[in-house]
């Protein structure tokens, strides 16, 4: 009945509703049917959120912060539904809401505790800073403060730097990890305990490849089954690092099954893509193709980074010409 938020029953006519920032929610309240229905929703026992009586809304005294954001299920009132439809919740809306329902038979009050969470999709980035390599797990907007854990080769790491900036309604968090010289795999997990939502970033470095000029190279990129769910929307991006910045070679969007290729020598095997294998080929290698190649598979719940180092060496003919 209440599809836009999940709520937990707790004692004493009190329920907890968990909403997401900027989404719509329903604060539930029901009563025994009766004539002359009066409904008053209040926030923190002080601010008028919504009033209904004598068959219509009376919003003259409504607190301005709720203007055009609340409504009742008018066709359901006679069936005992006093629930409040609440549009675009913000973190300032968190708190206790009291629903007063009176009829000619009885008066009841229900309390609803609204908690609001934020979890904008995090990202895992691979960065070069001078001679150092960093993995950075970051989330632009999150509330409440998340739990961030790092693992190296599936073993938890205690070292966990967190750069945190707080705004009025959420936190922005960066968690960098220096992985210079490491061949290990790394995993970063960001958990929002309120929204019961977890995101995982996984980074794997493949063995370096040595290729001759004019040859082609095949670089593997297959998602780990633990995270990957093919019926969930995701994006695959192949990019190459040049002078500290990545340039995109190609990307694939699962929602539209679209492939966009920016490098004419790049090829993707459509049949492999259909089997969730995003390995790529780069033809006709030249010396400037040496570098790091990054495959990024990302969805709302994970980012899987696979990095390949390619060394392109001059072919014998090129060497003899010199």
């Amino acid at each position: 009945i209440f599809p836009l938020a999940f709520f937990i029953y707790v004692p004493m006519n009190e329920q907890i509703v968990i909403g997401r920032l900027d989404e719509d929610i329903i604060l539930p309240s029901s009563f025994e049917r009766g004539s002359e229905v009066v409904i008053h929703w209040k926030y923190q026992d002080s601010y008028k959120v919504h009033s209904y009586y004598k068959g219509s809304d009376h919003l003259e005294s409504q607190d301005p912060r709720y203007a055009n954001r609340t409504s009742l299920f008018y066709n359901e009132i006679q069936n005992g539904n006093a629930s409040l439809f609440f549009r675009r919740v913000s973190l300032l809306d968190e708190g206790i809401y009291t629903c007063y329902v009176g009829t000619a038979i009885q008066v009841i009050t229900n309390k609803v505790v609204l908690k609001v969470g934020v979890f904008l999709t995090p990202v895992m980035k691979y960065e070069k800073r001078n001679t150092n390599s960093f993995l950075i797990c970051s989330v632009l907007s999150v509330y409440p403060r998340p739990i961030i854990t790092w693992k190296m080769d599936n073993t938890p790491i205690s070292e966990n730097n967190m750069e945190e900036t707080g705004s009025l309604d959420s936190f922005s968090i960066n968690s960098p990890l220096n992985i210079t010289g490491s061949n290990s795999s790394y995993e970063c997990t960001i958990e929002n305990s309120l929204l019961k939502q977890t995101w995982t970033g996984r980074w794997t470095m493949k063995d370096g490849l040595h290729k001759m000029q004019s040859e082609h190279v095949s670089l593997s990129c297959q998602p780990v089954n633990d995270y990957f769910s093919p019926n969930q929307d995701f994006k695959v991006t192949w990019s190459r690092m040049k002078s500290g910045t990545f340039s995109v070679l190609a990307y694939y969007l699962s929602s539209s099954q679209n492939t966009i290729i920016n490098e004419s020598r790049f090829s993707w095997n459509k049949e492999l893509i259909n089997q969730s294998d995003f390995s790529m080929n780069l033809m006709d290698l030249n010396l400037s193709d040496s570098g790091e190649y990054l495959c990024n598979i990302s969805s709302d719940e994970y980012t899987l980074l696979t990095i390949h180092t390619v060394h392109v060496e001059p072919s014998q003919e090129t060497a003899s010409h010199n």
Epitope: E36, V38, H40, K42, Y53, K54, G102, V107, T109
Partner: antibody
Framework: QVQLVESGGGVVQPGRSLRLSCAAS????????MHWVRQVPGKGLEWVAV????????DYADSVKGRFTISRDNSKNTLYLQMNSLRVEDTAVYYC?????????????WGQGTLVTVSS | DIQMTQSPSSLSASVGDRVTITCRAS??????LAWYQQKPGKVPKLLIY???TLQSGVPSRFSGSGSGTDFTLTISSLQPEDVATYYC?????????FGPGTKVDIK
């Protein structure tokens, strides 16, 4: 059963003040609106004031606006009427009355009343 | 503010008679009208609300009708215990004004 007992009435001079109280029992006081209604002996009923269940709204008859203040203490189950600048024409029996619901309906229970006499 | 008038201001009727009292509002008040009975020396008692709904415990000889501006209270068969003053009250919005009352007695 609902019981409303008014007190605080008496004889007072014009221009003076008086505070009426109404002790409520037999129902959840904090859930209901409350009214004061007055009646000059031998005359008709005159609605004086209403206060919502949570005291968030109050309304007054034009004849008492600015002079009378209705209030309530839900923790004490008590309704009040503070009457200032009393006039001879305020002489009446003052009834405390319970609203059907929150303070926007009719009176469904009445107290016995307390007599206020304004006289020099 | 909306004014309430009642007619007649008083009436005498015989036991068993049908008695009708009229209440008029100066502006429409939908069906937000209540009727009260006040017997001599007693406090008022609610008879009818929402213009036509009988309060529980009130004898069925009392009935109410009307909507908008014109309302009536009818006693289908007057009884000695019905001697009282009857008041209408509007409650669509404050001020919740009473009518001036109609005094009913037995001939």
């Amino acid at each position: 059963q609902v019981q409303l007992v008014e007190s605080g009435g008496g004889v007072v001079q014009p221009g003076r003040s008086l505070r009426l109280s109404c002790a409520a029992s037999g129902f959840t006081f904090s859930n209901y609106g409350m009214h004061w209604v007055r009646q000059v002996p031998g005359k008709g009923l005159e609605w004086v004031a209403v206060i919502w269940y949570d005291a968030s709204e109050k309304d007054y008859a034009d004849s008492v606006k600015g002079r009378f203040t209705i209030s309530r203490d839900n923790s004490k189950n008590t309704l009040y009427l503070q009457m200032n600048s009393l006039r001879v024409e305020d002489t009446a029996v003052y009834y405390c009355a319970k609203d059907l619901i929150s303070g926007i309906y009719y009176v469904d229970h009445w107290g016995q009343g307390t007599l206020v006499t304004v006289s020099s | 503010d909306i004014q309430m008038t009642q007619s007649p201001s008083s009436l005498s009727a015989s036991v068993g008679d049908r008695v009708t009292i009229t209440c008029r509002a100066s502006q429409g008040i939908s069906n937000y009208l209540a009727w009260y009975q006040q017997k001599p020396g007693k406090v008022p008692k609610l008879l009818i609300y929402a213009a036509s709904t009988l309060q529980s415990g009130v004898p069925s000889r009392f009935s109410g009708s009307g909507s908008g501006t014109d309302f009536t209270l009818t006693i289908s068969s007057l009884q000695p215990e019905d001697v009282a003053t009857y008041y209408c009250q509007k409650y669509n919005s404050a001020p919740f004004t009473f009518g001036p009352g109609t005094k009913v007695d037995i001939k």
